[in-house]
């Protein structure tokens, strides 16, 4: 069988949901002594990179700029070492958001709810579309679909402290064009249904994953990039639709 | 047709107690809220219950001083208002099934007319 380098890691810097007209950047984390990178938008050749000098870094950024709703869909990555070629990565779902209006979101029974009362979220949007998004600050990866002609529920269940935070959605006109974002809702769940005194909300993390993490080569760095990448790849979770 | 109907309201004594009623008929309804509005100020949330389980949230405001029940048989749903307050003269509404759609709105399609509680000092 052909012999091939491992497969890179591809990322979106900050975040995978770019507002129209503004830069989207994406890193492919490859090898060090990485001669090439080649960045492939739904199946094809987008963009190519050629860090200097390739053996003293370990990927590269892609800088897109003026993001619309052409440049929005699947990307993957791949890098050369000399002859020999990569795996290709797994894919990363790269969307434009602040696409024409504004959905509302709303929660029943209200912003402030006990542990084990059951919620919905709400988000309505007038204009053409069926498919609605709802995202957690902070865990912007776990997205959850809804479909409505103007309106689409998302029934939580009963609640737990787990589900404090600040909610935002979007209506989607496809997978990847994504409307303005709603105003926030901030949900407070107190610990048990007798006691509704107000806990503190969760504090919220960036996502993790959405960061480059490039690093430049000192000392053991090459010793330890091939084990390290290795166990990456083994663990990374990419994002579907 | 859906209907709700407040009535209980009236004019009493800071410390006095009063028990509001919302009739609600037409539908069934998964959650029956209590609001108020004072002149010049936003409608509030006070109090709301889950018609089925029954379960019961209030603003901290009116906790331990108000109390929000119901009756099945009669689609009622009653506040009642002990150790009243100025501050507690308002406009009260119950709506049904509300929903919170942040900066302090809340939004429902089923609302009361209202009824006008006065605290006097």
């Known amino acids: 069988p052909k012999q091939t380098l491992p497969k890179p890691i591809i990322r979106a810097e900050s975040t995978y949901m770019v507002p129209k007209e503004k830069q989207a950047t994406l890193c492919c984390q490859g090898s060090y002594g990485a001669v090439e990178y080649q960045l492939h938008f739904e199946g094809s050749l987008f963009a190519v990179e050629r860090p200097k000098p390739p053996e003293r870094i370990n990927g590269v950024k892609f800088h897109i700029p003026d993001m619309n709703s052409r440049k929005a869909g699947r990307y993957s990555c791949i890098y050369r070492v000399g002859e020999l070629w990569s795996e290709r990565s797994d894919l990363l779902d790269l969307v434009v958001t602040e696409m024409y209006d504004t959905p509302t979101l709303s929660v029943h029974p209200g912003p402030e709810v006990t542990s084990g009362e059951k919620v919905t979220f709400y988000c309505r949007l007038d204009t053409a579309t069926s498919m609605f998004l709802l995202l957690k600050e902070g865990r912007s990866r776990d997205v959850q679909r809804s479909y409505g002609k103007v309106q689409a529920e998302f029934p939580m269940g009963p609640v737990t402290t787990a589900h404090r935070g600040s909610y935002r959605c979007f209506g989607s006109y496809n997978n990847y064009a994504w409307s303005f974002p709603s105003e926030p809702v901030k949900l407070l769940v107190t610990g048990d249904i007798e006691n509704t005194s107000l806990a503190p909300t969760d504090p919220t993390f960036p996502d993790s994953w959405d960061t480059c993490l490039l690093t430049r080569e000192t000392g053991l760095q090459k010793d330890l990039a091939l084990w390290d990448h290795t166990a990456q790849n083994h663990h990374h979770h990419h994002h579907h639709h | 047709d859906v209907q709700l109907v407040e009535s209980g309201g009236g004019l009493v004594q800071a410390g006095g107690s009063l028990r509001l009623s919302c009739a609600a008929s037409?539908?069934?309804?998964?959650?029956i809220h209590w609001f108020r509005q004072a002149p010049g100020k936003e409608r509030e949330f006070v109090a709301r219950?889950?018609?089925?389980?029954?379960?019961?949230f209030y603003a901290a405001s009116v906790k331990g001083r108000f109390t929000i029940s119901r009756d099945n048989a009669k689609n009622m749903v009653y506040l009642q208002m002990n150790s009243l307050k100025p501050e507690d003269t308002a406009v009260y509404y119950c709506?049904?099934?509300?929903?919170?759609?942040?900066?302090?709105?809340?939004?429902?399609?089923?609302w009361g007319q209202g009824t006008q509680v006065t605290v006097s000092s």
């Open positions: 219950i889950w018609w089925i389980e029954r379960t019961t």
């Open positions: 037409g539908r069934t309804f998964n959650t």
């Open positions: 709506a049904a099934d509300a929903r919170y759609t942040g900066s302090r709105r809340w939004e429902s399609d089923y």
